[in-house]
Amino acid sequence: QLSLPSILPNENEKVVQLNSSFSLRCFGESEVSWQYPMSEEESSDVEIRNEENNSGLFVTVLEVSSASAAHTGLYTCYYNHTQTEENELEGRHIYIYVPDPDVAFVPLGMTDYLVIVEDDDSAIIPCRTTDPETPVTLHNSEGVVPASYDSRQGFNGTFTVGPYICEATVKGKKFQTIPFNVYALKATSELDLEMEALKTVYKSGETIVVTCAVFNNEVVDLQWTYPGEVKGKGITMLEEIKVPSIKLVYTLTVPEATVKDSGDYECAARQATREVKEMKKVTISVHEKGFIEIKPTFSQLEAVNLHEVKHFVVEVRAYPPPRISWLKNNLTLIENLTEITTDVEKIQEIRYRSKLKLIRAKEEDSGHYTIVAQNEDAVKSYTFELLTQVPSSILDLVDDHHGSTGGQTVRCTAEGTPLPDIEWMICKDIKKCNNETSWTILANNVSNIITEIHSRDRSTVEGRVTFAKVEETIAVRCLAKNLLGAENRELKLVAPTLRSELTVA
């Protein structure tokens, strides 16, 4: 840690005679510089030079060849590396007065005559005299204004809005400044900052727009940080809205965005007069071109029970916004002709949800359904097969005689989705067939009996059982069953010999 530089003359303030020369020496443990009252354009008679000495210290000399009223002010010697833009200069100070009987007040720039006050805060009206002994009064439209005066700074106080004039008398001669205008600015102790990005997803070539609004505050400095900032890719705008209340709207526009413009867009607002800071951020993504992603919440083969109500939900991520349509068996779904409805809702900026709703599922609702999402850059689809599940039912149970051989075939036709399984049962004691225990399942490997199954179409099946020889009356039961239910029917098979006897009788 370096100790503060030192100044010769070692005084807080010094009065220098008009048109005389003076010099200030600064000593430091590192390289030192001077800050002085005049701007660089006015400082032609200020010379700064480095001086060698044996002390091992760095020495910088400020020399004024002909002192004038404009040289009145604070001279600060500081270490070069300690100066930062935001902080007040840290160093050693000396205040120089150059009394001039013809110039009572230190000349000021035009901006110094605008005094900005925050609400009811105190402010300084910076009329500084060239002579510390000069008496000064402050006046406004109502007369003399009571305020404390310091010849190094000016009048300090709480001032109402309006013009103020400083008045001084030097050797019987009256001097007046031009009016200082006190202007009140709205400022709050907390920053109310809002960020808005109507969109956060763009594609190449589009224009990114982000706004930050500061409410009830006029003393604000707002900085943007964003991916293209360093390369000047962004145009800012400030709009001041006064009604119904003060609102500063800062807009950042990035025309013809590219993928490189993706990233965090941040606005940081700082109250110009207080150490109050607020920051907001939004993440923007720029895609080379538009895109579509389809994410179904169900599989490619779906089943629905007859008369059931069922919803099929598909999540879609897309930009630009997609057109979403549904097809059945490659034909556009005509909703008003069926008890099927579709809808699309926007969940988030680029997220959509589409639903296909079956109100009361019917057999004819089975088929291939396709959702198609498309925008100017992409087309995506997803197809699934829907089966309406129908309980099994027996359509027909008939027998077929083989003539003289005595063989008989029983055919059982059943329908349902999924396709029913057919089982055969037999009851050999015709008198006891009312009792379930009299029925036995017909196994495939029984000699003289052949069972076979044929699919007739997607939902119809035919089962056949062939008895090589029926020697006594038996009952045959066809049992058709699938996931949703079972149905059975029975048939009596009469032996051919018995049949002929019946015929004779």
Partner: antibody, heavy 121, light 107 residues
Framework: EVQLVESGGGLVQPGGSLRLSCAAS????????MNWVRQAPGKGLEWVSF????????YYADSVKGRFTISRDNAKNSLYLQMNSLRDEDTAVYYC??????????????WGQGTMVTVSS | DIQMTQSPSSVSTSVGDRVTITCRAS??????LAWYQQRPGKAPKLLIY???SLQNGVPSRFSGSGSGTDFTLTISSLQPEDFATYFC?????????FGPGTKVDIN
Amino acid sequence: EVQLVESGGGLVQPGGSLRLSCAASGFTFSSYSMNWVRQAPGKGLEWVSFISGSSSTMYYADSVKGRFTISRDNAKNSLYLQMNSLRDEDTAVYYCARLRYFDWSYAFDIWGQGTMVTVSS
Amino acid sequence: DIQMTQSPSSVSTSVGDRVTITCRASQGIRSWLAWYQQRPGKAPKLLIYAASSLQNGVPSRFSGSGSGTDFTLTISSLQPEDFATYFCQQATSFPFTFGPGTKVDIN
């Protein structure tokens, strides 16, 4: 050849309306933001309005806000400026200009030849 | 709004002379400045963008420099076709603003 051609200027009474057009050719019109810039006789250049490539964003100079409307038709490669409630101070040559981002800065790289608008009673 | 000022407002000079035009912005605009040339009765033409980058097809006798608030356009050796008005323009903030122009005419 890249070019912009303005049309639609003329003499109009104060309070009247006029619609300027700018036909673009030789470049992908929809890929660029476009602007109107005007120049009063013997005076400097004044930016009037901006429109982004897809018409999603428009900005105006305070002097024309609420009276002028910028628009474009990318299918026709055309830029428009609808001017209502015209005033004497709107008298100027109106240029359409393409805004282009070069690495490190924006600039108006292509200008039309201009169309004269005279507002006078 | 960012105010742009130019100096001088006009300059009388001869072919072969070196001409320097300065442009000042009311607040820092980094290097986001463009220079345009406008011949009488013609549309402006872009000479320099980003304070110092020469636009394609513009002769190398034109050069630009500066950043922040102070910028310079230099014509190293004036040619007859260079007699025109020159404008600077800031491209960092809406409304885009131009300098009032500097007229370069024959002495």
